[in-house]
Interface confidence: low
């Protein structure tokens, strides 16, 4: 049996994946649940099995096709339903008319690499993954650098208000280990949110030259 309120949130990665999280206050006991996607004007539909991520929330990924295929566009509507099994029947627990390009969350940037490192600066590049060609250059990035003795949460955010897949970090300390992360967000979409942070890139600045005053 299901009681209590539920929250059903989904994001489109702009290509061929819709990720959903369903939270339910009441208890679900040994109940199988799934998300069903029914696009309004396309021949296909898709289902994924909700798997527990915490005591009261479940998640799944609707794989719509090959990772770089453009499966939905700005005028698509996808009816998303949470269905839970009750005996031999399926009960609709939540429903939403999902507008993919109003609910975007891109994949985390990939292929981070140090292009050039010096004593006080480091040039880093990255790539975006599975991002729709519809965005053209309408993307922004946030980056952060982890310094020794600090946490990621304490790291100041650097904002790049354009599609710029590199950054030059300045005023770094020589011969010091750092980590760097970046995330991306399209400018489009009322409920669009930041991608997950990229995998951290570790790098070390060069030591200061011997015999020089610092």
């Amino acid at each position: 049996a299901v009681n209590g309120t539920s929250q059903f949130t989904c994001f489109y990665n702009s290509r061929a994946n819709i990720s959903c999280v369903w939270s339910q206050d009441g208890a679900l006991q040994d109940t199988s649940c799934q998300v069903h996607a029914w696009p309004d004007r396309r021949r296909w539909n898709q289902t994924c099995e909700l798997l527990p991520v915490s005591q009261a929330s479940w998640a799944c990924n609707l794989i719509l096709g090959a990772p770089d295929s453009q499966k939905l566009t700005t005028v698509d509507i996808v009816t998303l339903r949470v269905l839970c099994r009750e005996g031999v029947r399926w009960r609709v627990m939540a429903i939403q008319d999902f507008k993919p390009f109003e609910n975007l969350r891109l994949m985390a940037p990939i292929s981070l690499q140090v292009v050039h490192v010096e004593t006080h600066r480091c040039n880093i590049s990255w790539e975006i993954s599975q991002a729709s060609h519809y965005f053209e250059r309408h993307l922004e990035f946030e980056a952060r650098t982890l310094s020794p003795g600090h946490t990621w949460e304490e790291a100041p955010l650097l904002t790049l208000k354009q599609k710029q897949e590199w950054i030059c970090l300045e005023t770094l300390t020589p011969d010091t280990q750092y980590e760097f992360q970046v995330r991306v967000k399209p400018l489009q979409g009322e409920f669009t949110t930041w991608s997950p942070w990229s995998q951290p890139l570790a790098f070390r600045t060069k030591p200061a030259a011997l015999g020089k005053d610092t």
Epitope: W38, D40, R41, R42, R43, T73, T74, V75, I77, T79, I95, Q96, D97
Partner: antibody, heavy 119, light 106 residues
Framework: EVQLLESGGGLVQPGGSLRLSCAAS????????VHWIRQAPGKGLEWLGV???????DYNAAFISRLTISKDNSKNTVYFQMNSLRAEDTAVYYC?????????????WGQGTLVTVSS | DIQMTQSPSSLSASVGDRVTITCQAS?????MYWYQQRPGKAPRLLIY???NLASGVPSRFSGSGSGTSYTFTISSLQPEDIATYYC?????????FGQGTKVEIK
């Protein structure tokens, strides 16, 4: 067979309201969106809005302040209401549905219902 | 809104003639549709997704184009093709139609 049947047209006073019905058969309005399109006498086609399978709507911004599209899933019927009517709203009003495949346009149309706004 | 400009607004051609109608969009669109409307009737879908023939539509009808420029062709005009033809974009809301091209037989 997919069919759409509009009703509710007729003579309406300026400033009055209009409520049209679109009865769907051969498919469920819980699975497909239903659009409304109109055509003034001797003029072209104008898209007004749509109600999607889950109940959400998209409207032409030019009509958003006076247009409401709703539906009754149990009756498999979509409703179109427009307020503050004026003479230029005189038109044949159609409901339409897209086909099943990718972007296959308005494959199914009702026969249309004529609305005349006049005193 | 994306404006759709059809040309010509009307034309007269002989049976068997090749007839071409163009539709120019005010900005780039991804998908173009063409409809036929006979007097007193609802529109009928002829071409979807720029170049695909709708079910039951004769092969003398065809469509092509991309970006802002699209073309609709009747390869051999038949008496039953007397109608008004409309283009329509389905890339951005509001969905918009061309003003129509009236085709008559000489």
């Amino acid at each position: 067979e997919v069919q759409l049947l509009e009703s509710g047209g007729g003579l309406v006073q300026p400033g009055g309201s209009l409520r049209l019905s679109c009865a769907a058969s051969g498919f469920s309005v819980t699975s497909y969106g239903v659009h409304w399109i109109r055509q003034a006498p001797g003029k072209g086609l104008e898209w007004l809005g749509v109600i999607w399978s889950g109940g959400s709507t998209d409207y032409n911004a030019a009509f958003i302040s006076r247009l409401t599209i709703s539906k009754d899933n149990s009756k498999n019927t979509v409703y179109f209401q427009m307020n503050s009517l004026r003479a230029e709203d005189t038109a044949v009003y159609y409901c339409a549905r897209a086909g099943d495949a990718n972007y296959d346009g308005f494959a199914y149309w009702g026969q249309g219902t004529l609305v005349t706004v006049s005193s | 809104d994306i404006q759709m400009t059809q040309s010509p607004s009307s034309l007269s051609a002989s049976v068997g003639d090749r007839v071409t109608i163009t539709c120019q969009a005010s900005s780039s669109v991804s998908f173009m549709y063409w409809y036929q409307q006979r007097p007193g009737k609802a529109p009928r879908l002829l071409i979807y997704d720029t170049s695909n023939l709708a079910s039951g539509v004769p092969s003398r009808f065809s469509g092509s184009g991309s970006g802002t420029s699209y073309t609709f062709t009747i390869s051999s005009l038949q008496p039953e093709d007397i109608a008004t033809y409309y283009c329509q974009q389905w890339s951005t809301y509001p969905l918009t139609f061309g003003q129509g091209t009236k085709v008559e037989i000489k």
